[in-house]
């Protein structure tokens, strides 16, 4: 399918006469009839097998025909055909005079013909125009012609149908010869096959549109060249899909058991030491001055209550400072400048002179402790009650309120049997008809071996400078009675200026 195009350019009829020689009145109002037919060695009348076309009146006598393709398509003249172009043709161009407005052949007198030309030859499909000029005795016609293919037809004979498309059935444009030219990213006979992302694995990947790489089951990655490990595999790899080969330091079916958390995560901060303590578990041992699970927080140095004898602690940028109450000195207010005359013992404690009055010791009533009896004893701080018993402070003593099924001073006895090892400190339990009995090891006594027999705190000779040592039987502690000229809890300092301490 194509179009034979004829472009009329100029017609010369200077004398304004018809083919018969008779002049036109008032001038030759000229129009053209064109007949296109199959090749004939001698062009003869007969059917215009390839088509026919007529023009309106284009001018009078001599005139140039302007290109009117943009204004309605009358010039060039179009002679479409819907068959394979044979490559040869015959063309008849007749110039006629139109006395009136009716240009139909039957409406014209037979002598209205001005001129007639007939040509034949071969003509290849192409964009280039062939220029021709035909002259007779009285007229001259200049024209050009060509054959081009209709839209979607290609090839030397306009016989190849090719319609560009970009859909499920193909993605291509047409080359001049009618062959398909695939759009970028498509391949195959009809350009239906997408070109996958460069490097996409041939077996493990595929695509449904260009530059894509979709992975087949068991594969992943930009190029589908990485296997997918077993679902849930945390710290493992695979060489084929669904494997889970554990990385070093990991164990378990899914390689999710962290056998070396410290190395993998370095959770401990500020120079703390990390210890693996089981699967995904660790313990940080903090350097002095730090706290928190990961030793991530600084420790306020006053938190450890370093100041003694009622001293108050103040945090400082470079550490802490103890503000000592009257009568005490030292880095931790640990040294006393008081004597019994200063009534240093609180809460009803009784004062005993030591070292000829240069020092003293407080004997505290039950429920109080400390060098000045300044601390209330909370006998429950050590959580003495066993088996979930509730500890209650009762004046100078404590008692345990036991959960059902338990008894004993510390709820340490499972009612009426020895199953819960009621005897403290390694005592041996004996079941009796009306209860049980504990046989205690050396150094312990009481119904449940809970009472520790007093030890001699002076046995280790803790006092210096020939001081006399006294044992405080209620607290198992010692008190040093200093000779004249010495002070200190162990009589270790000569009397004089308060000592300077290296710490």
């Amino acid at each position: 399918s194509g179009v034979f195009q004829l472009q009329l350019q100029e017609f010369i009829n200077e004398r304004g006469v018809l083919a018969s020689g008779r002049p036109c009145e008032p001038g030759c109002r000229t129009f053209f009839r064109v007949c296109l037919k199959h090749f004939q060695a001698v062009v003869s009348p007969g059917p215009c097998t390839f088509g026919t076309v007529s023009t309106p009146v284009l001018g009078t006598n001599s005139f140039a025909v302007r290109d009117d393709s943009s204004g309605g398509g009358r010039n060039p003249l179009q002679l479409p055909f819907n068959f394979t172009w044979p490559g040869t043709f015959s063309l008849i161009i007749e110039a006629w005079h139109a006395p009136g407005d009716d240009l139909r052949p039957e409406a014209l007198p037979p002598d209205a013909l001005i001129s007639k030309i007939a040509i034949q030859g071969s003509l290849a499909v192409g964009q280039n125009w062939l220029l021709d000029e035909q002259t007779s005795t009285l007229t001259r016609l200049r024209y050009s012609y060509r054959v081009i293919c209709s839209d979607n037809y290609y090839g030397d004979n306009c016989s190849r149908l090719c319609k560009k498309r970009n859909d499920h059935f193909g993605h291509y444009v047409c080359q001049p010869d009618g062959n398909l030219s695939c759009l970028p990213g498509w391949t195959g006979e009809y350009c239906q096959q997408p070109i996958c992302l460069s490097g996409c694995h041939e077996q493990n990947g595929y695509c449904s549109k260009p530059a894509e790489c979709l992975c087949r089951p068991g594969w992943q990655g930009r190029l589908c060249n990485e296997c997918i490990p077993h679902n849930g595999c945390r710290h493992g790899t695979c060489s084929t899909p669904w494997q889970c080969t554990c990385d070093e330091g990991w164990g378990g079916l899914f390689c999710d058991q962290d056998l070396n958390y410290c190395t993998h995560h370095s959770p401990c901060k500020n120079g703390a030491t990390c210890s693996n303590s089981g699967q995904r578990s660790y313990t940080c041992t903090c350097r002095p001055g730090y706290t928190g699970v990961d030793c991530e927080l600084e420790l306020s140095e006053c938190d450890s209550n370093p100041c003694r004898n009622g001293g108050s602690c103040k945090d400082q940028e470079d550490g802490y400072h103890c503000l000592c109450p009257p009568g005490y000195y030292g880095l931790h207010c640990e040294h006393s400048t008081l004597s019994c005359a200063d009534s240093p013992c609180f809460n009803g404690g009784s004062c005993r002179e030591r070292n000829q009055g240069a020092n003293y010791a407080c004997e505290c009533p039950p429920n109080f402790t400390g060098s000045n009896c300044e601390k209330k004893v909370d006998r429950c701080t050590s959580n003495p009650c066993a088996n979930g018993g509730q500890c209650l402070n009762r004046g100078p003593s404590r008692m345990c309120r036991c959960r059902p099924g338990f008894t004993g001073t510390y709820c340490e006895l499972h009612v009426s049997d020895c199953a819960r090892n009621p005897c403290a400190h390694g005592g041996t339990c004996h079941d009796l008809e009306n209860g049980l009995m504990c046989t205690c090891p050396a150094g312990f006594s009481g119904r449940r071996c809970e009472v520790r027999t007093s030890i001699d705190a002076c046995a280790s000779s803790p006092c210096f400078n020939r001081a006399t040592c006294y044992t405080d039987l209620s607290t198992d502690t010692f008190v040093c009675n200093c000779p004249y000229g010495f002070v200190g809890s162990r009589c270790e300092f000569p009397v004089g200026l308060p000592p300077s301490f290296p710490w």
Epitope: P267, V293, D294, E296, L297, E298, S300, E317
Partner: antibody, heavy 119, light 108 residues
């Protein structure tokens, strides 16, 4: 985006135990670096840090509350909890759970739950 | 404990003005471990600044933090109507973690 939500009774009697739970959604409580924390705000007052727990169960508490509180974690349920014993009216506050992702800056908070201690 | 003191308690300014909120620590805050939060009524606080001067993703650049040692500042360069809320500072260098008592920013 990970979200936190507190749940528990809004009214607790004095001397009883306050129990709250913080549920973690759209994320795992197992993320190793995170500190899962409790913070409270007394009515019309400032914020007070209570303590934190890590996925491994390691805890650190505010010394002022240490004797009364226990924080625990249940990784299987993706939540952590606060228990506070012997409550008094002074424990009436909005209790928030929050996440600190590696240092103790709290980038994600629950909406908060008001707990009133009253008989 | 490190005590954090914020001043002023209330700051009255107009939209478009510059706000300067102060936070002072009773002891030096090491590593510049100081954060700022904004709290709207009935809501949880929202982290604005950490490490003294690092702005959290999504926080407008009109918010900035500065300071070191014991003195820290939150600056809002040009106040918008939504900025008039309660602001807290927090130190996280030393245990226990502590917050300031807050500064309320109100419209003049």
């Amino acid at each position: 985006q990970i979200t936190l939500k507190e749940s528990g009774p809004g009214l607790v009697k004095p001397s009883q135990t306050l129990s709250l739970t913080c549920t973690v959604s759209d994320g795992s409580i197992n993320s190793g670096g995170s500190y899962w924390s409790w913070i409270r705000q007394h009515p019309g007052k400032g914020l007070e840090w209570i303590g934190y727990i890590k996925y491994s169960g390691g805890v650190h508490y505010n010394p002022s509350l240490k004797s009364r509180i226990t924080i625990s974690v249940d990784t299987s349920k993706n939540h952590f909890s606060l228990k506070m014993t012997s409550v008094t009216a002074a424990d009436t506050a909005v209790y928030f759970c929050a996440r600190a992702p590696g240092s103790h800056t709290f980038d994600i908070w629950g909406q908060g739950t008001m707990v009133t201690v009253s008989s | 404990d490190i005590v954090m003191t914020q001043s002023p308690g209330t700051l009255s300014l107009s939209p478009g003005e510059r706000a300067t909120l102060s936070c002072r620590a009773s002891q030096s805050v090491s590593n510049n471990y100081l954060a700022w939060y904004q709290q709207k009524p009935g809501q949880a606080p929202r982290l604005l600044i950490y490490g003294t001067s690092n702005r959290v993703s999504g926080i407008p650049d009109r918010f900035s933090g500065s300071g070191s040692g014991t003195d820290f500042t939150l600056t809002i360069s040009r106040l918008e109507p939504e900025d008039f809320e309660l602001y807290y500072c927090q130190q996280y260098s030393r245990s226990p973690i502590t917050f300031g008592q807050g500064t309320r920013l109100e419209i003049k």
